[in-house]
Interface confidence: medium
């Protein structure tokens, strides 16, 4: 089941998926001047069985000016650099993505890939938030959001994170007005079935991430 809305927006924060749940789709987008090969896939799909998950379909781009198809090759270093990447660098990788059952790791780049990747998340996906440069985190709880199915509708849980400017005098989190959950639903709502998968293992993964450092490369 695809998540049919966006993860919550936290002022001065961005978020990242550390691994992608089976069912996640990644658009096959090509950079300017290139297009998908005629019979090429629209998207890559994270699929798997109980022991192994991987991305089905290959994205392939060809020059818009020619009719020839390009072969799937690993980009040269300068081509890889062209793509704006956002990676997690940490002295201690939180969890090897391949070891997270039912999840795929970040797919490798393909030749002439677009500068931006477009993912379509599924129920059970977890994303992790961090404050952007120049802001620091005030935690009231986990800085993550999970896509859940509630009353037959998907929604994202509200991350308990406030990002405050380093120069600002920081208040205790309790003094700040709490942000509303998406669609105004309180997080304590338990009146109906909530479907999430792998929650236990994802929570453990989040715990290991506490000391992780995220860095964003800007061009």
């Amino acid at each position: 089941e695809l998540c049919d809305d966006d993860p919550p927006e936290i002022p001065h924060a961005t978020f990242k998926a550390m691994a992608y749940k089976e069912g996640t789709m990644l658009n096959c987008e090509c950079k300017r001047g290139f297009r998908r090969i005629k019979s090429g896939s629209l998207y890559m799909l994270c699929t798997g069985n109980s022991s192994h998950s991987s991305w089905d379909n290959q994205c392939q781009c060809t020059s818009s000016a020619t009719r020839n198809t390009t072969k799937q090759v690993t980009p040269q270093p300068e081509e890889q650099k062209e793509r704006k990447t956002t990676e997690m660098q940490s002295p201690m990788q939180p969890v090897d993505q391949a070891s997270l059952p039912g999840h795929c790791r970040e797919p490798p780049p393909w030749e002439n890939e677009a500068t931006e990747r477009i993912y379509h998340f599924v129920v059970g996906q977890m994303v992790y938030y961090q404050c952007v440069q120049g802001y620091r985190a005030l935690h009231r709880g986990p800085a993550e959001s999970v896509c859940k199915m509630t009353h037959g509708k998907t929604r994202w849980t509200q991350p308990q994170l406030i990002c405050t400017g380093e120069m600002e005098t920081s208040q205790f989190p309790g003094e700040e007005k709490p942000q509303a959950s998406p669609e105004g639903r309180p997080e304590s709502e338990t009146s109906c079935l909530v479907t999430t998968t792998d929650f236990q293992i994802q929570t453990e993964m989040a715990a290991t991430m506490e000391t992780s450092i995220f860095t964003t490369e800007y061009q």
């Epitope: 927006e9 789709m25 629209l42 956002t86 931006e116 990747r117 477009i118 993912y119």
Partner: nanobody, 131 residues
Framework: QVQLVESGGGSVQAGGSLRLSCEAS?????????MGWFRQAPGKKEREFVG?????????SYADPVKDRLTISRGNAKSTVYLQMNNTKPEDTAVYYC??????????????????????WGQGTQVTVSS
């Protein structure tokens, strides 16, 4: 690549309403793009942010000069975005541009407000508000 076509521009009386549409087309999957509106007033070099909406229509962001008069929404097919402005003023006269942005890596914030963050642009539609 995505193509954007604006429509609905023209002349409107001050105090009236304005409704612009932007149709997105191109070989892509589902709701892949956030959409925004910018405007360029006569004699101005910069395109000014008007408002934006996230790819599923969950979030919107409006510029201060118009936020009490503006609604941006997405059509059911998600490939159309609408700008509805009420109580128009002569200073709303401008060329209005529809723009689209993709979601950057697996890291992104949901509504973009700066023109540099937009990857695709329409040709623009002229709106003239006369007093």
């Amino acid at each position: 690549q995505v193509q954007l076509v604006e429509s609905g521009g023209g002349s409107v009386q001050a105090g009236g309403s304005l409704r612009l549409s932007c149709e997105a087309s191109g070989p892509t999957l589902f709701s892949s793009y956030g959409m925004g509106w910018f405007r360029q007033a006569p004699g101005k070099k910069e395109r000014e942010f008007v408002g934006a909406i996230s790819r599923y229509g969950t979030y919107t962001s409006y510029a201060d000069p118009v936020k009490d008069r503006l609604t941006i929404s997405r059509g059911n097919a998600k490939s159309t975005v609408y700008l509805q402005m009420n109580n128009t003023k002569p200073e709303d006269t401008a060329v209005y541009y529809c723009a689209a942005y993709t979601y950057s890596g697996s890291f992104y914030s949901t509504v973009k407000t700066h023109h540099d963050e937009y990857h695709y642009w329409g040709q623009g539609t002229q709106v003239t508000v006369s007093s």
